[in-house]
Interface confidence: medium
């Protein structure tokens, strides 16, 4: 076996809750027969496990083999190029893949109108791959927070940014009519995880919503 094939320039994880994807950049001048071998090391078990012998894509979903990520010391991954009998040196992820690397997301944001109040409910992610006991709220059981961006249309399109510490919130619309749009970005106050803004959800308030009396 020669090792004259160049190594993948970089290898990294991009992860959301129970969606753990390994990515790598292709070797220069790869041929149609070039593929990539992926191996995984779990901290505490110091041996590399071969996961895929020949992936022709530039990413690999490692969720199924890293289901214990949230209860472990983390992982490293490595990738090498393979072309026939030739293979490159391994390129290893340069950081430990742990719970800290997971980008926090929400499942969705639901808005409804009740007597002129806009009630917001943040739905937490419920990935199919997650074991039954590993819910978002059990893994991140304390200090969950959500930044909320509120946009009013018509209006001057400025955002109101506020932080809430619950999955439910209410908007005080002061009798205004129009469209209220909300985005949410999760965080955990005790952790350094990045958060991703949700898709914007909008709801329209018309004059009829302010005539109801309890």
């Amino acid at each position: 076996h020669g090792t004259e094939l160049p190594s993948p320039p970089s290898v990294w994880f991009e992860a959301e809750f129970f969606h753990h994807i390994l990515h790598w950049t292709p070797i220069p001048n790869q041929s149609e027969s070039t593929c990539y071998e992926v191996a995984l090391l779990r901290y505490g078990i110091e041996s590399w496990n071969s996961i895929s012998n020949c992936s022709q894509t530039l990413s690999y979903d490692l969720t199924a083999v890293t289901l214990d990520l949230y209860h472990s010391n983390g992982y490293r991954a490595r990738v090498r190029a393979v072309d026939g009998s030739r293979h490159s040196n391994w390129t290893v992820t340069n950081t430990r893949f742990s719970v800290d690397e997971v980008t926090l997301t929400v499942g969705s944001v639901n808005l409804e109108i009740h007597n002129g109040f806009i009630l917001g409910k943040i739905q937490l992610p419920r990935p199919k791959m997650a074991p039954a006991n590993d819910t978002y709220e059990s893994i991140f059981s304390h200090f969950r927070e959500y930044e909320i961006a509120i946009r009013k249309v018509p209006g001057n399109f400025t955002f109101t940014h506020k932080k809430v510490k619950h999955e439910n919130f209410s908007l005080l619309t002061s009798g205004e009519v129009g469209e209220f749009c909300v985005q949410v970005k999760p965080s955990v106050a005790s952790r350094s995880n990045k958060g991703m803004w949700s898709k914007e959800e909008c709801i329209s308030l018309t004059r009829q919503y302010f005539t109801v009396t309890n």
């Epitope: 007597n115 509120i150 506020k162 209410s170 009396t213």
Partner: nanobody
Amino acid sequence: QVQLQESGGGSIQAGGSLRLSCAASRYLYSIDYMAWFRQSPGKEREPVAVIYTASGATFYPDSVKGRFTISQDNAKMTVYLQMNSLKSEDTAMYYCAAVRKTDSYLFDAQSFTYWGQGTQVTVSS
């Protein structure tokens, strides 16, 4: 300027009821929202109930829904908080708050302009 004065706090056994009052110095029609917040030592001020004075529409967080009721008496310029089935975790200083119009929209303490001095509620188990 709106002055707010709370009353009705006190000590009570778990499972009991209390009714808090908040008297405003101006007619409620000059205010969009009246609310009750509470704060226990070392914690942030949290919303408990809010009423939209124009329609009487109300909103409650899940922690008190079904146990607390906010109401208004426009003639007396007063807002009430009826608290039933009190629990030890309801122990806190309770504050009345008001806002003429909020452009920050979110139901939280920063959205409210006028505040009372607070009345202490202590629930023992």
